[in-house]
């Protein structure tokens, strides 16, 4: 392009000019040959959506085995390929544990883990690299007022859903409360006055926010009333996505 | 940079070499100045996240006018060009359809569609490429208890807002429930006991989460009580943004 | 698992999370603000404390977030309200609670509601109550736009870093 530019501007160049043109042309060509691929690589490296292959968690596997974290090795359970291998992200869906507990499913239905994110019910969600993450959670609840009581309204119940972090560079100390939501429900008693259970009520407690996390920190959800969680499809989930 | 590089590697260059070096250096610099930005632009244009200008709602404008959405015209409503052409994103705001239905507006007020996202009330929101999307929805509801009834509280109503996907690679079969929120409201009857309508109640049912979507899949909202939707500004919306 | 309380834990207030240097990822404009717990009858947003921060151009001025560059942003906010039970002798009066994120822009002559939630709460007889409102969405914003909040029911806010917050990040 440089040669063409000079030719166009200066007309024919002869003698010593030819050598200069040759040098200029060769230099331009070499520069292009080097600059273009390097620029392509540089731009691709910097475009955040495109960060190359799957990044696996680089935490010390020995330490992991010692702690018995047993993080989920993503089986090829999902038919789809990981659509965005460069982006640490996770979406976990609520699953009932025995004994009225809240567990999380990482591979069924809409659930997934990408780019080195790991999950275990025992330890929570571990993010593979330092960064700014948008964390979110929604817990659906359901219940009925138990029988009895003279008032038309039953005893209130305050439902809380909270997101904590622990471990990693943050240290092994007290887990840190990151985000939480709450809702007080006052169930209606049996409207027919038959002293039976009241009608079913539903509510959802959700939230989301930015948190700066370090590699190896674990994020998990704690809730006040696991026995009232609604595990119907789409109702209860939590997740994280790296945004910076 | 070329000159410095040569100087550093080859020591001092004199006489005719200096001129050649000058030409080479200048050509190299000009070539870099032209090649690098052009390459950057070319690569950015080819990176799949970057698919060009604003795509407006593809719904039949005639049909829309028929529905008489009647949005408030803001001064200089949309002076902006598409601010980030490379990012598939959409924000749709609730609009009343005839017959107590919930429709969505894709271009007025704060609503927008970017980078090949398309919307029609009949088909929902179509995303232009495979990827990881954060989908969100908030539906505001309002109402009052109807007159009558001996109890101080009216009949409970459970409000649900649900996000589904259909079509695309997912197949033409049954739509798939992705995310859902619910809230049971038990309106208070006329406190003065005049058997009139109870006081207005308000609530919102919202959620958001990550979903891996494929190009051509459509996402849409379904709600339980379209007659109770609050269409005041900022109350009812849904959207999607590609995060990876 | 730790007990769930709506007050900041000692651990949380005693030690802040070390600030990150995100060498491996390009910083994007982002902000996460928390309600100032020392101001009980107003909602003042704070940055650079606890887990709150302003990053890559975001600034806080007159209790509003200033958008640093034009683009698409995800904007979110949450508040949590609480209150006491009413006395059995008193007539229960409904309480109106609302929280809104507003945009003030050179393009519009007024504050435009972006995110808005309302709730009528009827306090129960027996227990105190809690109610949270969270909302978030994507918006096309222009450099210099101001994002602010308006809240009804401020005396009922539960001001802690985990319950009352306001943020945005460029996509």
């Amino acid at each position: 392009m440089g040669a063409l530019g000079l030719e166009g501007r200066g007309g024919r160049l002869q003698g010593r000019g030819s050598l200069l043109l040759a040098v200029a042309g060769a230099t331009s060509l070499v520069t292009l040959l080097l600059a273009v691929p390097i620029t392509v690589l540089a731009v691709l490296a910097l475009v955040p959506q495109d960060q190359g292959g799957l990044v696996t968690d680089t935490a010390d596997p020995g330490a992991q085995a010692q702690q018995g974290l047993g993080f989920q090795k993503l089986p090829e359970e999902e038919p789809e390929a990981d659509l965005s291998p460069g982006l640490p992200a996770a979406h976990l869906i609520g699953a009932p544990l025995k004994g009225q507990g809240l567990g999380w499913e990482a591979t069924k239905e809409q659930a997934f883990l990408t780019s080195g994110t790991q999950f275990s019910d025992a330890e929570g969600l571990a993010l593979p690299q330092d960064g700014l993450y948008y964390l979110y959670c929604l817990v659906g609840y359901r219940g009925r007022a138990p029988p009895g009581g003279a008032e038309p309204r039953g005893r209130s119940v305050t439902l809380r859903s909270s997101l904590y972090r622990a471990g990693g560079a943050y240290g092994p100390g007290t887990p840190e409360l990151l985000l939480e939501g709450a809702e007080t429900v006052t169930p209606v008693l049996d409207p027919a006055g038959r002293q039976g259970y009241g009608p079913l009520w539903y509510t959802s407690v959700g939230f989301g926010g930015l948190v700066q996390l370090r590699r190896g920190e674990r994020v998990y959800v704690n809730i006040s009333h696991p026995d009232m969680v609604d595990f119907a499809r789409g109702k209860t989930f939590f997740g994280a996505v790296m945004v910076g | 940079m070329g000159a410095l590089g040569l100087e550093g590697r080859g020591g001092r260059l004199q006489g005719r070499g200096s001129l050649l070096l000058a030409v080479a250096g200048a050509t190299s610099l000009v070539t870099l100045l032209l090649a690098v930005p052009i390459t950057v632009l070319a690569v950015l244009a080819l990176v799949p996240q970057d698919q060009g200008g604003l795509v407006t709602d593809t719904a039949d404008p005639g049909a829309q006018a028929q529905q008489g959405l009647g949005f408030q015209k803001l001064p200089e409503e949309e002076p902006e060009a598409d601010l980030s052409p490379g990012l598939p994103a959409a924000h749709l705001i609730g609009a009343p359809l005839k017959g107590q239905g919930l429709g969505w507006e894709a271009t007025k007020e704060q609503a927008f569609l970017t980078s090949g996202t398309q919307f029609s009330d009949a088909e929902g929101l179509a995303l232009p490429q495979d990827g990881l999307y954060y989908l969100y929805c908030l539906v505001g509801y309002r109402g009052r208890a109807p007159p009558g009834g001996a109890e101080p509280r009216g009949r409970s109503v459970t409000l649900r807002s649900s996000l589904y996907r259909a079509g695309g690679a997912y197949g033409p079969g049954t739509p798939e429930l992705l995310l859902e929120g619910a809230e049971t409201v038990t309106p208070v009857l006329d406190p003065a006991g005049r058997q009139g309508y109870g006081p207005l109640w308000y609530t919102s049912v919202g959620f958001g989460g990550l979903v891996q979507l494929r190009r051509g899949e459509r996402v849409y909202v379904n709600i339980s009580h379209p007659d109770m939707v609050d269409f005041a500004r900022g109350k009812t919306f849904f959207g999607a943004v590609m995060v990876g | 698992l730790p007990g769930v309380g709506l007050t900041p834990s000692a651990a949380q207030t005693a030690r802040q999370h070390p600030k990150m240097h995100l060498a491996h990822s390009t910083l994007k404009p982002a902000a996460h603000l928390i309600g100032d717990p020392s101001k009980q009858n107003s909602l003042l947003w704070r940055a650079n404390t606890d887990r709150a921060f302003l990053q890559d151009g975001f600034s806080l001025s007159n209790n509003s977030l200033l958008v640093p560059t034009s683009g698409i942003y995800f904007v979110y906010s949450q508040v949590v309200f609480s209150g006491k039970a009413y006395s059995p002798k008193a007539t229960p009066t409904p309480l109106y609670l609302a929280h809104e994120v507003q945009l003030f822009s050179s393009q519009y002559p007024f504050h435009v509601p972006l995110l808005s939630s309302q709730k009528m709460v009827y306090p129960g007889l027996q227990e105190p109550w809690l109610h949270s409102m969270y909302h978030g969405a994507a918006f096309q914003l222009t450099q210099g736009d101001q994002l602010s909040t308006h809240t009804d029911g401020i005396p009922h806010l539960v001001l802690s870093p985990s319950t009352v917050f306001f943020g945005a990040f460029a996509l």
């Epitope: 018995g68 974290l69 047993g70 993080f71 989920q72 090795k73 089986p75 699953a95 009932p96 544990l97 025995k98 567990g103 999380w104 499913e105 990482a106 069924k108 999950f119 275990s120 019910d121 025992a122 659906g140 359901r142 969680v229 609604d230 595990f231 119907a232 109702k235 | - | -």
Partner: antibody, heavy 118, light 111 residues
Framework: DVQLQESGPGLVKPSQSLSLTCSVT?????????WNWIRQFPGNKLEGMGY???????NYNPSLKNRISITRDSSKNQFFLKLNSVTAEDSGTYYC???????????WGQGTSVTVSS | DIVLTQSPASLAVSLGQRATISCRAS??????????MHWYQQKPGQPPKLLIY???NLESGIPARFSGSGSRTDFTLTINPVETDDVATFYC?????????FGGGTKLEIK
Amino acid sequence: DVQLQESGPGLVKPSQSLSLTCSVTGYSITSGYYWNWIRQFPGNKLEGMGYISYDGSNNYNPSLKNRISITRDSSKNQFFLKLNSVTAEDSGTYYCARDAYSYGMDYWGQGTSVTVSS
Amino acid sequence: DIVLTQSPASLAVSLGQRATISCRASESVDNYGISFMHWYQQKPGQPPKLLIYRASNLESGIPARFSGSGSRTDFTLTINPVETDDVATFYCQQSNKDPYTFGGGTKLEIK
């Protein structure tokens, strides 16, 4: 992919103990889920015998309670069945399976045939 | 224990026709807003294979010819249209209460 494989003796004498091993690959048994033993009698009737949870807790079918023990070795990613005082009625095909909470038993071993006979 | 009663015990259906299998529980298997009822297909010499979870959700990789419905105590597995490959025994199973229990099975044959 997640795979389960049962192993153990195919023939056990009455009154002795039956010991079977389930080896799991592709997923850590301490990560999540419930790890079950199910048996199928010659007439094709299926019986859930019990499970060990990801956290190490157990649950056994009351009909077997005094005879059954399910344990695990996390380092080898294996879990085990021990059934004491076996009789001819304990003959059948023994399967190990992963119970994915409310998502059903999504992965099964191929099964191992056990005959109780002197 | 929750007893699951399957009917019919065997079923002969023509190719391309609909097969319907019923499962009745001795008590409700619903909890937390979902039904803890699952359906399996077992072919000779193979372990059972999960077809439907939570009463009506198709397991990944299972053809849409299989569908499930029902709640609380009454559940149905439907195969429509029946294909040659569907010859097998089908079992319902509940996981709402320990111990897990299975139905007695329904053997499907082609007419």
